[in-house]
């Protein structure tokens, strides 16, 4: 039951996270004009990954897309790429995780297949979340650098009669949405990976205890498992259940080479 809950919660958290990453990517307020001493402004500028906007105090808002590709800063292109990669990985992860959900039955899908799919989607969510966090952080760093550069410019070269009002930009709402969404996707991915451990079938090689009976050696497996000669070499990839009534969730598993596809 706990594994199902962990998997379900991981899916929901990742879903919210990816929705947030998509929202952040589409938002126009990645950077907003710094109002410093003046909370009321006649002209308010803000910028997104795809367009820049101006809102006048009259209420009129005008947005212009960045119609050039080569003329854009490399950092902006990098942030765009990171966010898109995050969305694509997240979307694929969501698709995979839907089929991996324990509550959804698809034909006669093996538990091991569901475990592998859960792990795959979990890793995808983790990478997706990291991409979003990286993208937002790169943009934030770019803003901080530009902010202090423009601040320096504001206080230099003012010897002349004419002053130029330097527009400084600070963190926009999209950055916070992106950070939170990336974090949620990351958490969801970790939860999926944890759930995967509980989903995978029993594959542990149990150490056999030898009892020397008269005449020939027989190795007995503890806990009601079948006895076999040797030390479990033929039990690899076989489900050997004891008579106890155990739910699938309670069957503890450990990662094997087959879990990482």
């Amino acid at each position: 039951m706990a594994v199902t809950a962990c998997q379900g919660l991981g899916f929901v958290v990742s879903l919210i996270g990816i929705a947030g990453i998509i929202a952040a990517t589409c938002m126009d307020q990645w950077s907003t004009q710094d109002l410093y001493n003046n909370p009321v402004t006649a002209v308010f500028n803000y910028q997104g990954l795809w367009r820049s906007c101006v809102r006048e105090s009259s209420g009129f808002t005008e947005c212009r897309g960045y119609f050039t590709l080569l003329g854009l800063p490399a950092m902006l292109q990098a942030v765009r790429a990171l966010m898109i990669v995050g969305i694509v990985l997240g979307a694929i992860g969501l698709l995979v995780s839907i089929f991996a959900l324990k509550c959804i039955r698809i034909g006669s899908m093996e538990d091991s297949a569901k475990a592998n799919m859960t792990l795959t989607s979990g890793i995808m969510f983790i990478v997706s979340g990291l991409c979003a966090i990286a993208g937002v952080s790169v943009f934030a760093n770019m803003l901080v650098t530009n902010f202090w550069m423009s601040t320096a410019n504001m206080y230099t070269g003012m010897g002349g009669m004419v002053q130029t009002v330097q527009t400084r930009y600070t963190f926009g709402a999209a950055l916070f949405v992106g950070w939170v969404a990336g974090g949620l996707t990351l958490i969801g991915g970790v939860m999926m990976c944890i759930a995967c451990r509980g989903l995978a079938p029993e594959e542990t090689n149990y150490k056999a205890v030898s009892y020397h009976a008269s005449g020939h050696s027989v190795a007995y497996k503890p806990g009601g498992f079948k006895a076999s000669t040797g030390f479990g070499s033929n039990t690899k990839n076989k489900k050997i259940y004891d008579g106890g009534a155990r739910t699938e969730d309670e069957v503890q598993s450990y990662p094997s080479k087959h879990d990482y596809v």
Epitope: A42, Q47, E56, S58, G59, R64, V162, T164, V165
Partner: antibody, heavy 118, light 113 residues
Amino acid sequence: EVQLVQSGAEVKKPGASVKVSCKASGYTFTSYWMHWVRQAPGQRLEWMGMIHPNSGSTNYNEKFKGRVTITRDTSASTAYMELSSLRSEDTAVYYCARLKTGNSFDYWGQGTTVTVSS
Amino acid sequence: DIVLTQSPDSLAVSLGERATISCKSSQSLLNSGNQKNYLTWYQQKPGQPPKLLIYWASTRESGVPDRFSGSGSGTDFTLTISSLQAEDVAVYYCQNAYTYPFTFGQGTKLEIK
């Protein structure tokens, strides 16, 4: 047709207060910022402050802060400008004006003459 | 506050001639976000409130005759009346629409020569 109709001329003594009204019609009153601008004889136009009729949020020129209060009555589609502690230099024509695209004033009231004299 | 200085203070032009009024700003009125200049021109006739002519430095308000045109960028702006008509006799003001408090030029009185 958009119209801004202001209250009549006022004569006040120094230290007194004056409240000028501006009734809007022909448009959605709550959708546009209403500004107040004054013009003293032979002087340039001087921006005093503004109010958003929908939210009631205001912004004033520092020069008039503490002396000017802009309010509105949405049910009557009317904006008000009250100037206190009147001085002789406050003698001017007071205008209300609607803000439009480009942060420009497209419609103005006819003006209210306020005379401050002892 | 932004200071706007108009020149000349008064101007006399013959009917049908070109009239040019200048407006200089103490700060740039160009907004980098949309590359628009936040300068507005008004016409005021005696006993009347100002009338909007030009906004964004060069965009003519609807209903304004096309003989009125605005130009300039940054700190230097010009209002041009290509062919002066008798009804154009008035005082013309420029306005900073970029930052609060909004400020106005001292005005240019246009007369017929």
